[in-house]
């Protein structure tokens, strides 16, 4: 379900990634250098920036991030 409107609830942050707010709604997600072989599965729809550098992701399927706006 959708999360309630709140200023005290944290947006979803994928395990082991580093996240920080980007304004009132959005989230910057840094998943660099984590040895990932695929995209993190629980990305917030409010992700404004995603860093996947220095991982082991060899290919992306078409439309790999359908949940993102």
């Amino acid at each position: 379900g959708s999360s309630p409107r709140s200023g005290v609830l944290l947006r979803g942050c994928p395990t082991h990634c580093h996240c920080e707010p980007d304004g009132r709604m959005l989230l910057r997600v840094d998943c660099s250098d984590l040895g990932l072989s695929e995209l993190p599965s629980n990305l917030s729809v409010f992700t404004s920036y995603l860093d996947l550098s220095m991982n082991n992701i060899s290919q992306l399927l078409p439309n790999p991030l359908p949940s993102l706006r």
Epitope: G7, V8, L9, G12, P14, C19, P21, R24, L26
Partner: antibody, heavy 117, light 107 residues
Framework: QVQLVQSGAEVKKPGASVKVSCKAS????????MQWVRQAPGQGLEWIGE????????NYNQKFQGRVTLTVDTSTSTAYMELSSLRSEDTAVYYC??????????WGQGTTVTVSS | DIQMTQSPSSLSASVGDRVTITCRAS??????LNWYQQKPGKAVKLLIS???RLHSGVPSRFSGSGSGTDYTLTISSLQPEDFATYYC?????????FGGGTKLEIK
């Protein structure tokens, strides 16, 4: 710099109401939520509720629902917390604090409310 | 409501020590955890958000880790100004709830 300046200590009788103010400066008041948290003597922190000053949308801890009212005056960048039907266990330090996307980054100095007959 | 259990409730340590404080949630909070520091007579201070993100101005000797229900705050080398009370807080669901606190005292 960001500052949250709260009103002074209050002593109230059981059954009365108290209204604590929190004047914000150093940032755009309507861009951040205001949280209210209390701390009873020797105890931990307890969330009371929050208000979005941009449109006065509120969330309350069910424990306080019906007894607490959060309001803002955007013309003076001031937030208010009113707690009614006071009882002795409401004796605590009450804090206002601003938040953005899930974390509280600046806190007021606290207002001591003592409920005693 | 999600219950947050912090341990230990108090801890004696010396300057230079490595200290770990743990926080356990009653259910998975998906890394949505903050850590705060409180000193007597001072405003509460944010140390870490999103489990591991150091707030601006917080020394790098502080670090946060964990996942699921179990999280830790580590101070790699205690400094005199670190003696205080520390609280964890979950930001996964309303109402946000705090741990009972860990009072860090000088040995």
């Amino acid at each position: 710099q960001v500052q949250l300046v709260q009103s002074g200590a209050e002593v109230k009788k059981p059954g009365a109401s108290v209204k604590v103010s929190c004047k914000a400066s150093g940032y755009t008041f309507t861009n951040y939520w205001m949280q209210w948290v209390r701390q009873a003597p020797g105890q931990g922190l307890e969330w009371i509720g929050e208000i979005d000053p941009s449109d006065s949308y509120t969330n309350y801890n069910q424990k306080f629902q019906g007894r607490v009212t959060l309001t803002v005056d955007t013309s003076t960048s001031t937030a208010y917390m009113e707690l009614s039907s006071l009882r002795s266990e409401d004796t605590a330090v009450y804090y206002c604090a601003r938040s953005l996307s899930g974390y509280v980054d600046y806190w007021g100095q606290g207002t001591t409310v003592t409920v005693s007959s | 409501d999600i219950q947050m259990t912090q341990s230990p409730s108090s801890l004696s340590a010396s300057v230079g020590d490595r200290v770990t404080i743990t926080c356990r949630a009653s259910q998975d909070i998906s890394n949505r955890l903050n850590w705060y520091q409180q000193k007597p007579g001072k405003a509460v201070k944010l140390l870490i958000s999103y489990r591991s993100r150091l707030h601006s101005g917080v020394p790098s000797r502080f670090s946060g880790s964990g996942s699921g229900t179990d999280y830790t705050l580590t101070i790699s080398s205690l400094q005199p100004e670190d003696f205080a009370t520390y609280y964890c807080q979950q930001g996964n669901s309303l109402p946000p709830t705090f741990g009972g606190g860990t009072k860090l005292e000088i040995k």
